[in-house]
Interface confidence: medium
């Protein structure tokens, strides 16, 4: 049981386009055909103006027109919904497909891709119907951009809603060694972080989030998966002790602001007959800023758990109320392989923390920054949705 760990199945709240808790000022666009099809008319089920956002120019062939929603705080976005321009039945414009881009800081933008690397999302078949798209994997974002597509020169219009929940973990990124491949007798088990949205260099992944923060915990048998049509090992990220002569895997975690850390929870595989073992112990250090030194002695937690039970499980590592914005944790090998499917944190924001959004990123620059106003401290009013993908409204 991952206490304090978010459940993606319950993270499906409307985030405020339709009910207007997202203000007009937080919706922006690359261009508009007219004031009556401006950004503010892009709300799902809205009939204001001419009934949708419509870009000024064609989206074919360049696909550069976008609708941007600023959620003000980091959210896990699990679904999106789209509609065309209804306009009392007179509108005929809709987008048959679209792409999504997202950002956590307004500087670096990532393309959303599904679990097989596909970026293009099937959209609407008519102007009025709502099509919901389950985002697998979900995205942790503050800003989301919709890029409507067309296969020829034609008018497209869009109304949208986003569904998800507040990203309470506060985790901005983790740095980890690239996951490896385990060769078993009957199968190759790919234990890479296949949805990681940061950078990869020198055998390290940095500056992003991926499968270790997607809410999906792995099965007892790591060769099997919660997801359909994926490869063996999909739910886990894993490392072989043969590649780590130091005897541990080291990871770093960066958070949105200064936090007091109670617990880290790591969902691990323990199928020891295939070499996967719980870590023998964990050591964590803390620091308050990127340029600072790691503070004091690390918090050490010995595990030395039972080998016998092969079931996957969450291990809780007490972090003793230490304060920081960065953590560095070493996971000690107790067997040939370490396999993790999820890492989450139970923490509290330090009240006097003025550092409410990360400083300039240390990753390569992306598009120019968007101007942010001050962050809201409370989540918006949220209404649960429980619709299946493509279900009627």
């Amino acid at each position: 049981d991952m206490k304090g760990h978010f459940d993606p199945a319950k993270c499906r709240y409307a985030l405020g386009m339709q009910d207007r808790t997202i203000p007009d000022s937080d919706i922006s666009v690359s261009s508009s055909w007219s004031d009556s099809t401006a950004a503010r008319h892009s709300r799902l089920e809205s009939s204001d103006g001419d009934g949708a956002w419509c870009p000024a120019g064609p989206v074919f062939p360049k696909e550069e027109e976008y609708l941007q929603v600023d959620l003000r705080r980091l959210h896990l976005v699990a679904l999106v919904g789209t509609q065309g321009r209804h306009a009392g039945g007179l509108g005929k414009e809709f987008s048959r497909s679209y792409r999504l881009r997202y950002s956590r800081d307004g500087r670096r933008w990532m393309d959303w891709k599904d679990r097989w690397g596909q970026e293009v999302i099937s959209g609407n078949e008519d102007p009025g119907g709502v099509v919901l798209k389950d985002l697998g994997p979900p995205m942790v974002a503050r800003l989301v951009r919709f890029y409507p597509r067309a296969d020829r020169v034609m008018s497209v219009c869009l109304r949208v809603e986003l569904y998800g929940c507040l990203w309470r973990d506060g985790l901005l990124s983790y740095t980890a060694p690239v996951g490896q491949t385990m060769q078993l007798s009957e199968v190759m088990v790919h234990l890479n972080d296949s949805t990681y949205d940061g950078y990869t260099a020198g055998g390290l992944q940095y500056g992003g989030l991926g499968q270790l923060a997607d809410g999906v915990v792995g099965l007892d048998d790591f060769r099997q998966s919660q997801e359909l049509r994926v490869w063996p090992g999909y739910d886990y990220v894993g490392w072989s002790n043969q590649s780590f002569p130091t005897g541990y895997v080291e990871m770093e975690f960066e958070f949105d602001r200064l936090r007091t850390f109670q617990t880290m929870q790591v969902h691990c595989n323990n199928m020891h007959t295939l070499g996967a073992r719980l870590p023998g112990g964990v050591e964590c250090r803390f620091k308050r800023g990127p340029a600072m030194a790691w503070e004091g002695e690390p918090v050490r937690h010995a595990l030395g758990g039972s080998l016998g039970d092969p079931r996957a499980r969450a291990i809780s590592v007490p972090l003793g109320g230490h304060v920081g914005r960065f953590l560095q944790c070493r996971f000690l090998f107790a067997g040939p392989w370490l396999l993790f499917s999820e890492i989450s944190f139970i923490s509290d924001v330090v009240n006097d923390s003025s550092d409410t959004f990360p400083p300039a990123p240390w990753w390569p620059p992306g598009p120019p920054p968007t101007n942010f106003s001050s962050l809201e401290l409370e989540p918006r009013g949220q209404q649960p949705v429980a619709k299946a993908e493509g279900s009627p409204t």
Partner: antibody, heavy 121, light 103 residues
Framework: EVQLQQSGPELVKPGASMKISCKAS????????MTWVKQSHGKNLEWIGL????????SYNQKFKGKATLTVDKSSSTAYMELLSLTSEDSAVYYC??????????????WGQGTSVTVSS | QIVLTQSPAIMSASPGEKVPMTCSAS?????MHWYQQKSGTSPKRWIY???KLASGVPARFSGSGSGTSYSLTISNMEAEDAATYYC?????????FGGGSKL
């Protein structure tokens, strides 16, 4: 048909060592972990340890560490258990058993016929 | 280590009778396996994951339980069911067997 064929009965002297074999057929030998079990006096069963033939991972019951050594020969699909420094307490029937581990649930689904070991001077 | 205590250690039953046997664990376990062994032969996997019947096991056998208390029941005893039944856990290191119930 899955079969585990063990070597024949052994009479050994105290202090000696011996090796029991378990030849597997009817399935992919490297695809399943092999376990070993001791049965004393025709009654109590004790788990000795296990070995994954493909990746060579072994795990032992602490009680049998230093007493039993598990190995495999992949080319002949044979698992071995060597028993060291035998005493009368080691007189028993020893079984190899294939471990079914699909879905993260473990059970010994096929057993060898057993090898009787008698330690006596 | 987890100690499994089986009861009764020895029992007898007539054909057609309902036969229950229990396996009590010294600490909570998540699943229990049962093996059947007839005199002079190897054990056979009989019930696994607490309640699933192994291939070829008659439907008159059933398994149930949770935590520290598990049971195997024969709803309608037949002569061929005469054997010793062992419970086994893999929740904790080392894996352990019960002392057996001889039927």
């Amino acid at each position: 048909e899955v079969q585990l064929q063990q070597s024949g009965p052994e009479l050994v002297k105290p202090g000696a060592s011996m090796k029991i074999s378990c030849k597997a057929s009817g399935y992919s030998f490297t695809g399943y972990t092999m376990t070993w079990v001791k049965q004393s006096h025709g009654k109590n069963l004790e788990w000795i340890g296990l070995i994954n033939p493909y990746i060579g991972v072994t795990s032992y019951n602490q009680k049998f560490k230093g007493k039993a050594t598990l190995t495999v020969d992949k080319s002949s699909s044979t698992a071995y258990m060597e028993l060291l420094s035998l005493t009368s307490e080691d007189s028993a029937v020893y079984y190899c058993a294939r471990l079914y581990d699909r879905g993260g649930r473990y059970a010994m689904d096929y057993w060898g016929q057993g090898t009787s070991v008698t330690v006596s001077s | 280590q987890i100690v499994l205590t089986q009861s009764p250690a020895i029992m007898s039953a007539s054909p057609g009778e309902k036969v229950p046997m229990t396996c009590s664990a010294s600490s909570s376990v998540s699943f229990m396996h049962w093996y059947q062994q007839k005199s002079g032969t190897s054990p056979k996997r009989w019930i696994y994951d607490t309640s699933k019947l192994a291939s070829g096991v008659p439907a008159r056998f059933s398994g149930s339980g949770s935590g520290t208390s598990y049971s195997l029941t024969i709803s309608n005893m037949e002569a061929e069911d005469a054997a010793t039944y062992y419970c086994q856990q893999w929740n904790s290191d080392p894996w352990t067997f019960g002392g057996g119930s001889k039927l």
